[in-house]
């Protein structure tokens, strides 16, 4: 299963596959989770070690039994990678790094006013993968404000160095966030020249065009199909890039195929996993396991539910039959592409959906009345969960915000249907930053049920918390994907970066707002809480935010959506905005339905609902 | 030119039977999957089988299981669809296709032979 | 079985409308979706493959969109032999399934 914790000072002995040199642990499992063989991964903070080589080292590993032993190492942290983790796997990283120098290849140099113009700038060239930025501050004047585009051979920097007043991140591409536009088309019997990056085996050229896309140095590719004249070279898909970032030229070649990395196309990436099966076609590699098994769909989720297996083929042949089961190879390879592919055989092959984001239709969870005042306009997909509730009557306007917390399912305030229990006049937007962005022909969801808690009484700050199915479930995408909860009861947890999100007034007395706004606010104790509201009861189930001074909160239309915490690089949300005296006021912090209280009641709901489990434990 | 013509078509009684058959040209023909597709008249497209280059693996679609058997002669160029028990709703054009290579679909078709069952 | 739904059934079009054609899928089928024009007592020919790119010989004002359950074929300027009937295919997994097919008639 999918496994989220980190260990603090601790180091895993053996295993290794790979190594690279990474900010922070996040991105070192980010990059575990994409390798093929990553299981397991060790990074060695600037902190925890003097050896300047292995200073932000990253150490992918692979084990047959899945852990391996871990030996104590003050700062050094290791986890696991996030394959089987559904809607957790992104290959999307916004982090900025301040005193870092990321170091690779320097192909572009330019001046700029601030770093998120530099990864901007990066995000929109074919082929920067990461970047650095001195900023004003920086102690030779030549080089201030310089932003350095980069590149290496394997996508992450040759190396990282701790450096004043220089700051570094990566592209934003594999956030469906550049934009240069990609090349959706794809061209047979045509082949690109320029120089080969890889070359795996494929089924066909969709299969080689997503293996192209999650390279870190593929810009283009050409397949050569199983009716290729050179039998060895059949199903051979050669990654490609060049010096200008497209084929310098291309050849009019019967039987192959070729097109484009959709790394850079805008608002949609394709899955980093491959779900279509192949019948009547036998998958080699390295052996990993034999099942018995009902039908080639059990054959590929039991491949998927072993971390290990990449690919795996059923056999139909009568003497890898008994009765109604039939033998499931479970197969690996170095590079995660089968080692050899064999057309008209008795069998059918497929991948692991181990990488695949959509994951199962569950809501999300981890083991161990209201523009916001004061903030800032938030950027795409940096908010993935939050939805917007809109009444439709006469004219259709916004209410509420929400969160997405499962495939069908969204976390609101029960105050938001106060007078409005109707589900058939409310429409829910997801994946949308501006509101001025909704037209008649915006796809919206609608509601098949509203379960307000049963304890919720109107015009009561109590139990403020309700629960949404959708009629239909939603696709998981950059944009659009949901926010894992708190573990029952969650009191251990110091959570000290925390958010509040919405489209709702900017003040006191003002209008909602067309871009969502999102502000960073700390928690207050409910001791504290209780002393600023001494006419209300704050309860256990409540949980506090604000600024001594006022100044920062949420406001009319923001009800409903999510107070998210980020702790272990890891968002939850821990409150749903609910109450408060006025908006932003001095000493009067915002009431919110602490959700880690709800846990029980949230999942008897959303699986009595379907009459079956809905939970996804990523830990 | 890829060429693909079919015959053998006709007017048979219920539980009669037919055997079609396409003959390539212009392509290796024994590199490539092919399919056999109908449309019974005034209707849309319906796939019926589907063959693999050495012959080796055949797919049919439930309405025809157990009745139609694919087959091809690569050194004839030719690619076969016997049909038994045959019934008044198998009625169709036949149309026989080369596999989209590495794609998937149908890229060349041919004109079709008509079989009408009817007593 | 994946079920394609394509509509409208049939539409009427003048020469240089602008013409569009939805297809949704049952499940997911990322780009393995073709599109194909009938013309009466012909087979058909083969359009659009892999959602959007345009197969050989056919004119450009045919285009192709979509990925995942919806996609859409769209003749961006109506000529005298499109009057057809169009289908929309998807080759993800047997068996092959064709949408119902849309016939576009002169208005």
């Known amino acids: 299963g999918c496994l989220t914790q980190l260990y603090e000072n601790a180091f895993f002995r053996g295993g290794d596959v790979a190594s690279m040199y990474t900010p922070n642990a996040q991105y070192c499992q980010m990059r575990c989770t994409f390798h093929p063989r990553c299981l397991l991964f060790s990074f060695l903070p600037a902190s925890s070690i003097n050896d300047m080589e292995k200073r932000f080292g990253c150490f992918l590993k692979d084990s047959v039994t899945g852990t391996l032993p871990k030996v104590h190492r003050t700062g050094a942290v290791s986890g696991h990678s996030l394959k089987q983790c559904g809607h957790q796997i992104s290959a999307c990283h916004r982090d900025i790094y301040k005193g870092v120098d990321m170091r690779g290849v320097n192909f572009n140099v330019s001046k700029v006013s601030s770093v998120e113009e530099c990864q901007k700038r990066c995000t929109s060239n074919i082929r920067c993968q990461f970047f650095s930025y001195a900023t004003q501050t920086f102690h030779k004047a030549e080089y201030r404000n310089n932003c350095l585009l980069k590149y290496s051979p394997g996508g992450t920097p040759t190396a990282i160095k701790v450096l004043s007043n220089v700051e570094s991140g990566f592209s934003l591409k594999p956030c469906a966030l550049s934009e240069i536009g990609c090349h959706m088309n794809i061209f047979q019997h045509l082949a690109f020249s320029d120089v080969d990056v890889a070359r795996v085996l494929t089924p066909d050229a969709f299969v080689c065009r997503t293996i192209c896309t999650y390279h870190p140095n593929c810009l283009f590719f050409t397949f050569y199909t199983n009716v290729w004249k050179i039998e060895s070279q059949r199903n051979v898909c050669l990654l490609k890039t060049s010096e200008s970032g497209t084929p310098s030229s291309s050849t009019p070649q019967e039987n192959t195929i070729s097109g484009y990395s959709l790394l850079t196309c805008k608002r949609t990436l394709p899955e980093p996993c491959h779900s279509k099966i192949y019948p009547g076609v036998d998958f080699g590699g390295e052996e990993l396991n034999v099942t018995f098994v009902k039908g080639v769909n059990v054959c590929q989720e039991t491949c998927t539910k072993m971390i290990r297996c990449q690919f795996f083929t059923y056999s139909l042949l009568p003497e890898d039959c008994k009765e109604e089961k039939c033998k499931c190879f479970l197969r690996l390879s170095m590079d995660g592409s089968p080692t050899r592919i064999a057309y008209g055989t008795q069998g059918s092959s497929g991948y692991s959906l181990r990488l695949c984001n959509t994951g199962d239709n569950s809501v999300c969870t981890t083991k161990t009345s209201t523009r916001i005042v004061g903030g800032t306009n938030s950027s795409w997909g940096e908010w993935p969960w939050q939805v917007s509730l809109q009444v439709k009557l006469t004219a259709q306007r916004h209410l509420c915000g929400g969160s997405l917390i499962g495939h069908q399912w969204v976390l609101t305030a029960a105050h938001c249907f106060d007078g409005l229990p109707l589900q058939d006049v409310w429409r829910i937007y997801s994946g949308i930053l501006n509101l001025s962005d909704i037209t008649k022909d915006t796809p919206f969801s609608q509601i098949k049920e509203i379960i307000i808690h049963q304890n919720y009484k109107v015009s009561e700050g109590n139990h403020d918390i309700a629960l949404i199915k959708l009629q239909a479930p939603l696709n998981y995408t950059e944009f659009q994907k949901p926010i894992c909860l708190p573990s029952k009861g969650d009191t251990s947890t110091i959570y000290t970066n925390c958010w509040v999100t919405g489209w709702g007034f900017s003040k006191e007395k003002g209008e909602i707002q067309n871009i969502l706004q999102k502000v960073n606010i700390p928690l207050v104790t409910n001791e504290e809480c209780q002393k600023r509201y001494q006419d209300y009861k704050i309860t256990q189930r409540m949980v506090c935010a604000g600024y001594k001074e006022g100044g920062k909160d949420a406001c009319k239309g923001d009800s409903g959506g999510p107070l998210v915490c980020k702790h272990n690089g890891m968002w939850r949300l821990v409150g749903i905005t609910s109450w408060g005296e006025g908006c932003a006021r001095r000493e009067q912090p915002g009431v919110y339905t602490k959700v880690a209280e709800y846990m029980d009641w949230i999942l008897e709901k959303t699986q009595s609902s379907d009459g079956k489990a809905q939970m996804q434990s990523p830990a | 030119e890829v060429q693909l013509l079919e015959s053998g078509g006709g007017l048979v009684q219920p539980g009669g039977s037919l055997r079609l058959s396409c003959a390539a040209s212009g392509f290796t023909f024994s590199r490539y999957i092919m399919w056999w597709v109908r449309q019974a008249p005034g209707k849309g497209l319906e796939w019926v089988s589907g063959i693999y280059s050495s012959g080796g693996y055949t797919q049919y679609a439930d309405s025809v299981k157990g009745r139609f058997t694919i087959s091809r002669d690569n050194s004839k160029n030719t690619l076969y669809l016997q049909m038994n028990s045959l019934r008044a709703e198998d009625t169709a054009m036949y149309y026989c296709a080369r596999e989209l290579e590495g794609l998937g679909g149908f890229d060349y078709w041919g004109q079709g032979t008509l079989v009408t069952v009817s007593s | 079985d994946i079920q394609m739904t394509q509509s409208p059934s049939s539409l009427s079009a003048s020469v240089g409308d602008r013409v569009t054609i939805t297809c949704r899928a049952s499940q997911s089928i990322s780009s393995y979706l073709n599109w194909y024009q009938q013309k009466p007592g012909k087979a058909p020919k083969l359009l659009i493959y892999?959602?959007?790119s345009l197969q050989s010989g056919v004119p450009s004002r045919f285009s192709g969109s979509g990925s995942g359950t919806d996609f859409t074929l769209t003749i961006s300027s109506l000529q005298p032999e499109d009057f057809a009937t169009y289908y929309c295919q998807q080759s993800y997994s047997t068996p092959l399934t064709f949408g119902g097919g849309t016939k576009v008639e002169i208005k």
């Open positions: 892999a959602a959007s």
